[in-house]
């Protein structure tokens, strides 16, 4: 065996283990004939704290008093320095600085499940920084005792490995933990308990749910529990919710009826158990059961709106639109919508099932009184039909809302305001605000949006399907019985100057004046609602300011006459467009020379 300290020794007094704040004496002494050759008086013993010199002495031994050592471990090393040679390592020693253990606090014991074993936890108090041994003792009836030790540096948990049984559930047991290290010992206060106090049941398992006759109103939750369980608590919530519904039940025997579940909703269920009304603790929550409740027939009614379009003298196109039911109203997966169209006087009726759409278009005669009914169907049944009489929504001029305005209200919102119609305002049953993207061709495929407003409201904030830099055609309808009046306006939530001007595609001469025709600016370049077009013209090769004509914007207009040009003079013409934010750049330039006679 190699002797690491063959040249000398390091001794520590009073001990290698000291209380924080204490002083230690460290002695380094050379063994016989281990000093510097020839010059033993020249022995220079040096004491290092780790690698930092703290003391030295000439001779065969060195004594050093050390104070102020920190908590934890410090390594001291003694070396010998001789003339003309490297320092020689003599020996080393560790000193451990710590404190006596504090009294362990909050000792508590638990047995997980009726077949589990007793385990206790406690709070150690402040770190001793020393090797500390913990002994846990349990004493029970008939002088029975059990003991377990733990030598882990951070010991605050021990399992006795014994199982308490329910034969005498009221028998008392007492636990105590004692901490011991080189500087002292301390014991916890005793903790006394019975079987019922410390047994924490295992969480329930094998959780199932049954819906009798596939109905949400006849729902039973089943589970399995340990034999002695008396109480259960159930918690459940829709999977998309953070709030739990809680139910406490006694002597449930592994089943409970739930009466307030919503149809067609995924729920999460958990159960916990307890052995006694006021003793012991609740088990952990069981693993979650996730289950979807069955469908029920839809409630509520569809919000239906429509549009009429004249085709010819005998036919009209009806486009029906409806909004999806809310999840709580649909109460299942909507399989189809049933649309019934009926001529009220002749009683002719046509029914159609629509899947995958929330709109329907058909052509009907312009004569007769027509009504539609729309309902939503899932696997369990249909909602109540929404019935609408088809009328000319804008026929009653006296019902037209007045002073309609549309103003941007923050990002992607438009505030629509109006005044009640001149005709008795109290006759209005409701207002409908309708909006759709403005397309110059009057495209009927453009999605329609609407909202309903109570008769006492004179404003509505529209935000659904509103995009920046897009112009919307907004209509406000006032409905009264089988009559309606409407007013319209253009509006946008955000605008800037158009990106381009109109493209002049033709200039024709008519009776001494000219007719300018242009192509509309593409919708994506309009950047909001157009207010005006400007037509500019000036003589070719002239440096004079151009003349201009400003035309109010109308959706369908794409030509305009100008009659102030001189004959046989060549002009250059171009156009711009304006929104409330400014004027576009020039469109294309066209030259034209009027051939007519001079006045």
């Amino acid at each position: 065996k190699i002797d690491a300290c063959k040249r000398g020794d390091v001794t520590v007094k009073p001990s290698h283990v000291i209380l924080l704040g204490s002083t230690v004496n460290i002695t380094c002494s050379l063994k016989p004939r281990q000093g510097c050759f020839h010059y033993s008086r020249r022995n220079k013993l040096i004491l290092y704290k780790f690698d930092r010199r703290i003391n030295f002495h000439h001779g065969h031994s060195l004594n050093s008093q050390v104070t102020g050592l920190p908590l934890g471990t410090t390594l001291f090393v003694c070396k010998l320095a001789c003339i003309n040679s490297d320092e020689i390592q003599i020996c080393g020693a560790e000193i451990f600085v710590g404190v006596a253990p504090e009294q362990p606090q909050n000792l508590s014991c638990i047995q997980k499940g009726e077949q589990g074993t007793v385990a206790c936890t406690w709070e150690r108090g402040r770190d001793t920084h020393l090797y500390t041994e913990y002994t846990l003792q349990l004493s029970g009836p008939k002088n029975l005792t059990w003991q377990k030790q733990c030598k882990d540096i951070y010991c605050d948990y021990l399992d006795f490995g014994i199982n308490l049984t329910p034969e005498s559930p009221e028998s008392n047991f007492t636990a105590k933990v004692t901490a011991v290290n080189s500087l002292g010992s301390s014991s916890s206060l005793p903790s006394t308990f019975t079987f019922l106090d410390i047994v924490r049941p295992l969480p329930p398992w094998d959780i199932r749910i049954k819906f009798q006759k596939a109905s949400v109103s006849r729902c039973t939750l089943y589970w399995r529990d340990e034999g002695l369980v008396l109480l259960n608590r159930l918690r459940y919530r829709p999977s998309n919710s953070r709030l739990w519904n809680m139910v406490n039940v006694t002597k449930a025997k592994g089943r409970h009826d739930l009466l307030d579940l919503k149809p067609f909703t995924e729920y999460e269920f958990q159960i916990s158990s307890k052995l006694h009304l006021y003793k012991g603790s609740w088990s952990d929550w069981s693993e979650s059961l996730r289950a979807q409740t069955p469908e029920e027939e839809p409630t509520g009614m569809l919000d239906v709106w429509y549009m009429k379009r004249h085709i010819d003298y005998s036919r009209q196109q009806i486009s029906l639109f409806w909004k999806n039911l809310s999840v709580s109203e649909a109460r299942g997966k909507i399989l189809h919508y049933q649309v019934t169209l009926q001529e009220l006087t002749g009683g002719k009726a046509m029914t159609q099932n629509i899947t995958g759409h929330t709109s329907w278009t058909t052509v009907i005669p312009r004569t007769g009184n027509w009504a539609v009914a729309v309902s939503a169907a899932n696997s369990k049944g249909s909602s109540l039909p929404t019935r609408i009489n088809i009328m000319n929504l804008c026929e009653a001029g006296l019902l037209a809302p007045r002073q309609v305005s549309a103003n941007s209200e923050g990002m992607d919102n438009i505030l629509v305001t109006w005044q009640p119609p001149r005709k008795d305002p109290s006759a209005v049953q409701e207002y409908v605000v309708e909006w759709r993207e403005l397309h110059p061709g009057g495209d009927t495929q453009v999605p329609l949006n609407w909202l309903r407003s109570r008769p006492y409201n004179v404003s509505a904030l529209i935000s659904e399907n509103i995009k920046s830099y897009i112009c919307y055609e907004i209509r406000v309808y006032a409905l009264s019985g089988d009559q309606g009046g409407c007013s319209s306006i253009l509006g946008n939530s955000k605008h800037k100057a158009p990106l381009s001007g109109p493209h002049i595609n033709a200039i024709t001469e008519e009776k001494g004046s000219i007719l300018i025709s242009w192509n509309s600016i593409p919708v994506q370049e309009q950047m909001g609602c157009l207010l005006h077009y400007r037509i500019y013209w000036k003589e070719r090769d002239s440096n004079s300011q151009p003349q201009l004509c400003e035309i109010p914007y109308r959706v369908s207009q794409n030509s305009h006459p100008i009659n102030s040009l001189q004959p046989r003079v060549t002009y250059v013409l171009w156009m711009t467009a304006l929104t409330a934010a400014g004027e576009s750049s020039h469109g294309n330039e066209r030259e034209f020379c009027l051939q007519g006679k001079a006045n």
Epitope: Y48, F50, D51, L75, V77, Q89, E94
Partner: nanobody, 125 residues
Framework: QVQLVESGGGLVQPGGSLRLSCAAS????????MSWFRQAPGKGPEWVSA??????????YYADSVKGRFTISRDNAKKTLYLQMKSLKPEDTAVYYC????????????????RGEGTQVTVSS
């Protein structure tokens, strides 16, 4: 008393492998960084590798001359430090010894508190 005893040295051919061990006793081992040094004949000590205090997942450091060939590890339960040496070269010939050290280990020689006597490694064909 603090003691570090190296073993595992010997004669090996170039390209061969050796595993050195350093058994610690008389001190707590776990709270200290540990290093391997080597000293070739007629030369001063050269730091080879170090491992942080604590578990086997402690950070490791290597001199450029041995990077990718040597691996340092420790087993705190056995109070033992290891150096696995592969692809050995004649210039690796030296006395290898372990030491209780403190960093840094990047650009300067680490601080040494205590070292073992060493074990001879000879790489020769």
């Amino acid at each position: 008393q603090v003691q570090l005893v190296e073993s595992g040295g010997g004669l090996v051919q170039p390209g061969g492998s050796l595993r050195l061990s350093c058994a610690a006793s008389g001190f707590t081992f776990e709270p200290y960084d540990m290093s391997w040094f080597r000293q070739a004949p007629g030369k001063g000590p050269e730091w080879v590798s170090a491992i942080d205090k604590g578990g086997g997942a402690g950070a490791t450091y290597y001199a450029d001359s041995v990077k990718g060939r040597f691996t340092i590890s420790r087993d705190n339960a056995k109070k033992t430090l290891y150096l696995q040496m592969k692809s050995l070269k004649p210039e690796d010939t030296a006395v290898y010894y372990c030491a209780i050290t403190a960093g840094p280990y990047s650009d300067s020689t680490p601080r040494v508190a205590y070292r073992g006597e060493g074990t001879q490694v000879t790489v020769s064909s």
